[in-house]
């Protein structure tokens, strides 16, 4: 049974005489008169089992003491630490010729753990041990002892175990403690890679290459390797591991990000606080969830704040100029926390009688600089119809507008374009032709461009070639032209007038009056 004594983490103790409870019971040769096991009290009044010999009066001493079998435990090189006290020969009366101040240390490798006798010739000498000048003074009970510490190493070892032996040649000495240990590079974590307990190499200059394994919740960046030096120190760390997304390095471990923190990638960064307007409710978050009403665009980094669509643009002003409209507005009060704001223009043409019945304006309308993705707060809209109700919506949009289920970020204005001269009348028809009259009818212009005040019919005899013509005005879309000559070709033109003026005349309609008193009904543009 051994008591616990604390030694460096890179040393593995195979034997510690001071930890043994009760007698050590090592083998001495000769059995009597040589090495003797003696119990002394340490500074805590705890008994220490020591071996002493003090045969200083007789020459040619050869007293051997052998330990029990010591297992090697896979170590190729072991270290022997001997704490001993040596009495100066000059403190012993009358022994100058026979007293020595050294002893010898030996070892013998063996697979047999039960060898009963000391066979001196089997042992290999490690060294002659002498009292060092630099001794430690230790309180043993009430007595100050000069305690020397010597460490020797031996290797390479190959058998299952070994025995140590101490040869006294005539010194007055006590072995206060014998400790046998090997060195290992202790289990360690470096650069987030764990390196296992590794026994040092066989010789004092060897380096053992060890591959590390990434700690939990981490992954290799470069293959982690270290070298275990002969002194049990890890050397030259190469490569490393990185904490997985959602984890950060804390105390050599990859620990989950705390609630309210996140880490998006496998990097050496620490977890970051969730960006504004986002949260994480679990440990180990790789991203943070946006607050209600806030969104993250596809190309937004996880580190960016969650944002929301902008509010509606402000202060929309319209300026109508005949069939053009200039619109200007101010930026929204709330941009949603984004810089990528732009504006889209929606144009709707609405009926005068029922403004709710609107339809898209179509492709004939033109926008300067553009209809969608406007970066400025003004737009010019041209090629509108005159005297038409239009509703224009200005939409403020940003990178997250598409995620908003309830858009409310537009402002609208309804305008009516100015009246203009109407377009020409497309179709004029002779409805009834007699010897002396022609009944005309026509359609409203395609684009009245205002309220039609009247229509003007211009006609003349064909052979006069417009040198002499007559004008008839009517508010209706038909008229009877009377007082014509029979069997004569007439040319008719019709135009409409609004408050803005006359439109262009229609294409000519040629009609010939009849010779007989009968009716000729004509649908065409040219009745004969």
């Amino acid at each position: 049974v051994t008591g616990s004594r604390v030694y460096p983490a890179n040393e593995v103790t195979l034997l510690d005489s001071r930890s043994v409870q009760g007698e050590l019971g090592w083998i001495a040769s000769p059995l009597e008169g040589g090495w003797e096991e003696v119990s002394i009290m340490d500074e805590k009044n705890t008994p220490i089992r020591t071996y002493q010999v003090c045969n200083v009066m007789e020459p040619s001493q050869n007293n051997w003491l052998r330990t029990d079998w010591i297992t090697r435990e896979g170590a190729q090189r072991v270290y022997i630490e001997i704490k001993f006290t040596l009495r100066d020969c000059n403190s012993l009366p009358g022994v100058m010729g026979t007293c020595k101040e050294t002893f010898n240390l030996y070892y013998y490798e063996s697979d047999n753990d039960k060898e009963r006798f000391i066979r001196e010739n089997q042992f290999v000498k490690i060294d002659t041990i002498a009292a060092d000048e630099s001794f430690t003074q230790v309180d043993i009970g009430d007595r100050i002892m000069k305690l020397n510490t010597e460490i020797r190493d031996v290797g390479p070892l190959s058998k299952k175990g070994f025995y140590l032996a101490f040869q006294d040649v005539g010194a007055c000495i006590a072995l206060v403690s014998v400790r046998v240990f090997y060195k290992k590079c202790p289990l360690t974590v470096r650069n987030l890679a764990q390196f296992p307990d590794t026994i040092t190499g066989a010789d004092t200059s060897s380096l053992v290459e060890v591959r590390g394994s990434c700690v939990n919740n981490s992954e290799e960046k470069d293959v982690p390797k270290m070298y275990c030096g002969a002194d049990g120190e890890w050397l030259v760390p190469i490569g490393n591991c990185l904490c997985n997304a959602g984890h950060e390095e804390r105390s050599g471990e990859c620990q989950a990000c705390k609630i309210g923190y996140y880490k998006a990638l496998s990097t050496d960064a620490t977890c970051a606080k969730c960006p504004p307007h986002s949260y994480s409710v679990w440990e180990g978050a790789t991203s943070c969830t946006c607050d209600r009403g806030f969104f993250r665009a596809d190309n937004d980094a996880a580190s960016m704040p969650c944002t929301r669509p902008p509010s509606a643009p402000l202060n929309l002003i319209s300026n109508v100029n005949e069939t053009s409209v200039n619109l200007e507005w101010s930026s929204p009060q709330n941009t949603g926390g984004r810089q990528d704001i732009s504006y889209n223009v929606v144009c709707k043409k609405c009926g005068a009688g029922d403004p709710s019945k609107c339809r898209p304006c179509g492709s004939g309308v033109h926008y300067t600089p553009q209809q969608n993705g406007l970066k400025t707060t003004k737009v010019s809209i041209t090629d509108l119809l005159a005297h038409t109700n239009y509703t224009f919506e200005i939409w403020a949009v940003n990178g997250v507008s598409k995620y908003n289920p309830n858009p409310d970020q537009s402002v609208s204005v309804t305008v009516t374009t100015n009246q203009a001269a109407p377009s020409s009348i497309a179709l004029v028809q002779a409805k009834e032709v007699t010897r002396y009259s022609v009944a005309l009818a026509w359609l409203e212009p395609d684009r009245p461009n205002g309220v039609i005040l009247e229509y003007e019919v211009k006609y003349y005899e064909k052979d006069q070639n417009e040198r002499s013509y007559r004008i008839v005005r009517t508010a209706a879309r038909n008229t009877d032209i009377k007082g014509l000559n029979p069997l004569t070709s007439y040319v008719f033109h019709v135009r409409a007038r609004t408050a803005a003026g006359y439109g262009d005349f229609s294409e000519p309609l040629e009609v010939t009056t009849n010779t007989v008193p009968s009716r000729i009904i004509g649908d065409g543009a040219n009745s004969t």
Partner: antibody, heavy 121, light 106 residues
Framework: QVQLLQSGAEVKKPGASVKVPCKAS????????MSWVRQAPGQGLEWMGW????????TYAQGFTGRFVFSLDTSVSTAYLQISSLKAEDTAVYYC??????????????WGQGTLVTVSS | EIVLTQSPATLSVSPGERATLSCRAS??????LAWYQQKPGQAPRLLIY???TRPTGIPDRFSASGSGTDFTLTISRVEPEDFAVYYC????????FGQGTKVEIK
Amino acid sequence: QVQLLQSGAEVKKPGASVKVPCKASGYTFTSRAMSWVRQAPGQGLEWMGWINTNTGNPTYAQGFTGRFVFSLDTSVSTAYLQISSLKAEDTAVYYCARVRFTVYGDGMDVWGQGTLVTVSS
Amino acid sequence: EIVLTQSPATLSVSPGERATLSCRASQSVSSNLAWYQQKPGQAPRLLIYGASTRPTGIPDRFSASGSGTDFTLTISRVEPEDFAVYYCQQYGPSWTFGQGTKVEIK
């Protein structure tokens, strides 16, 4: 078993000599020094000195020089105390004791049974 | 010559009690002090050497301490066979004994 065996009691007249033997057994005689201790009747212990059994070199305590001689016969593992010109005040038990040197300290670890020397006219 | 003075001269104790004996040196003897027990009609027996080290075979109820000039021998629980005279002895260049302390039954 380590033993020191001393001779029986001696009665001597003043002026005579006595040689007290101390035979060692159970250990190598020449490996340990031998000490001599006197104890007068009813009194305490008095160290007389010691002899190096390897070299034969004696050391005498104050008051035990001149008439007191330590000697050896290593062939029979025996140490001797010889007192000459005995006086009445030499009446005492004389002990031989093996000297033990250790790294922690010295002491007399094995004692003879003692020889009573009586000096009387 | 170094003089050792033991006290008390006589110590009366009952079996099972603790006994404490003192030895004072006229000058420092470091740890070079031994204790002996002598029973009537017997040779002394070595109890302690080096001020505090017990030889093999000495019961652990005997313990000792001290260095320099003041030394103590303690019998933790006195047994009937412990009633005897106890001597301290210093072994500097010249050895001397104290005058002894008699431990008797109370």
